[in-house]
């Protein structure tokens, strides 16, 4: 806390300029008017104040705006944003995407801080949904942003926003998240032709049901093994050997290297060994000839 002292003669700030950087902390407190600071916030970020000095300026703004800063001030916080606590940010009402971008720029290249997470939360809640422009902005700064949201939060993403999503944005998504995103992607890309559609939908396929995988197998898509390995096990199990062969195309040979890993391992256990042998890959573990497979889950459903 800076001790309150009278401003020395001739040192009263008439405007926010570079001379203030050479003021001691107590001089900043005594000689800079909070209202002047608020109206000239755009100049503050152009002056490389130390964080100690920024503490003093923050204190002045906190006194002027105890209920939270107006957006005109927030937009120009610059490095001062790094001094804000999540509690400070919860008092804000940020509606402009330009303000959001300006603050994210300050934190660019670093992991998402609690301050940034709070800011984004306030912004998205204020907008009511995660629209395309917001998603574009957030994934540009934080590629993993989408996968940090809960399935409930993802449900507010309109299908039109899916166009902003890049494959790397989904790298850390789990199946529950992809279950929510896949139907939106399917809707967003529904008017594209076969090969273009597959390129766009590929990263979302971890949420695809069996019937969609069956449909894709009829389109010569040549799915790579990395994508296949991310598919839902329950969606892969009902696929026939012929369907998997069509789905993977030339990549089918990669099944051998993955035969001990899910979903390939579980899928092999469900196939007839005769059918697996037709692939010529030496896959082992299928159902021996002459054995009858009873689907007990289906039987329970019928009774």
């Amino acid at each position: 806390e800076v001790e309150k002292t009278a401003c020395p003669s001739g040192k009263k700030a008439r405007e926010i300029d570079e001379s203030l950087i050479f003021y001691k902390k107590w001089e900043l407190e005594a000689c800079v008017d909070a209202a002047l600071l608020a109206t000239q916030m755009d100049r503050v970020n152009a002056i490389p104040f130390t964080y100690e000095q920024l503490d003093v300026l923050k204190h002045k703004l906190d006194e002027l705006y105890p209920q939270g800063y107006p957006e005109s001030v927030i937009q120009h916080l610059g490095y001062l944003f790094l001094k804000m606590s999540p509690e400070d940010i919860r008092k804000w009402n940020v509606t402009s995407l330009e303000t959001l971008k300006a603050l994210l720029e300050v934190n660019k290249g670093h992991e998402m801080s609690p301050q940034v997470a709070t800011l984004i939360d306030r912004f998205v809640k204020g907008r009511g949904q995660l629209d395309k422009d917001t998603l574009d902005t957030l994934t540009a700064f934080y590629p993993g942003y989408l996968c940090s949201l809960s399935p409930e939060e993802l449900s507010s993403v309109p299908p039109s926003s899916i166009w902003a999503v890049r494959p790397q944005d989904l790298d850390t998504c789990d199946p529950r998240q992809l279950d929510v995103l896949y139907p939106k992607a399917r809707l967003a890309f529904q008017n594209m032709n076969g090969s273009e559609y597959f390129v766009k939908i590929q990263s979302f396929l971890g949420g695809a049901p069996t019937e969609d995988l069956k449909a894709l197998s009829q389109q010569n898509v040549s799915m790579d093994l990395a994508t296949f390995m991310k598919l839902r096990t329950d969606a892969v199990l009902p696929l026939t050997v012929a369907e998997v062969q069509k789905l993977l195309g030339p990549h089918v040979e990669g099944l051998k290297a993955e035969e001990r890993h899910r979903p390939v391992r579980d899928w092999i256990l469900r196939q007839r060994q005769d059918d697996l042998d037709t692939l010529g890959l030496g896959l082992q573990g299928g159902i021996p000839n002459g054995y009858l497979v009873l689907d007990l889950s289906m039987q329970e459903a019928l009774s």
């Epitope: 490389p48 130390t50 964080y51 490095y79 790094l82 001094k83 670093h110």
Partner: nanobody
Amino acid sequence: EVQLVESGGGLVQAGGSLRLSCVASGRTSTIDTMYWHRQAPGNERELVAYVTSRGTSNVADSVKGRFTISRDNSKNTLYLQMNSLRAEDTAVYYCSVRTTSYPVDFWGQGTLVTVSG
């Protein structure tokens, strides 16, 4: 995060020169602005000069025309060239940095400059 070590201080005659150095280590890629401060016995610390990552620099009025600040990013080193030294320049000189990643100033231990007579 960032460690700073100053050197180059010592005893010098009034009118003489010294060159202070400050070497930064650690997460130096996050350094934005680098500063020289000083604290004379019985006085509070004051900012002497700064230089930003873009090369913009400035010095306090009390040392203008006598002190020059510079920075060599390839060596992660900050310099303060002090000419025409006066008795009132006697102080412990500290280097500090502002980074883009963490909202605190990082400080060195300081180097003592004594100007006699």
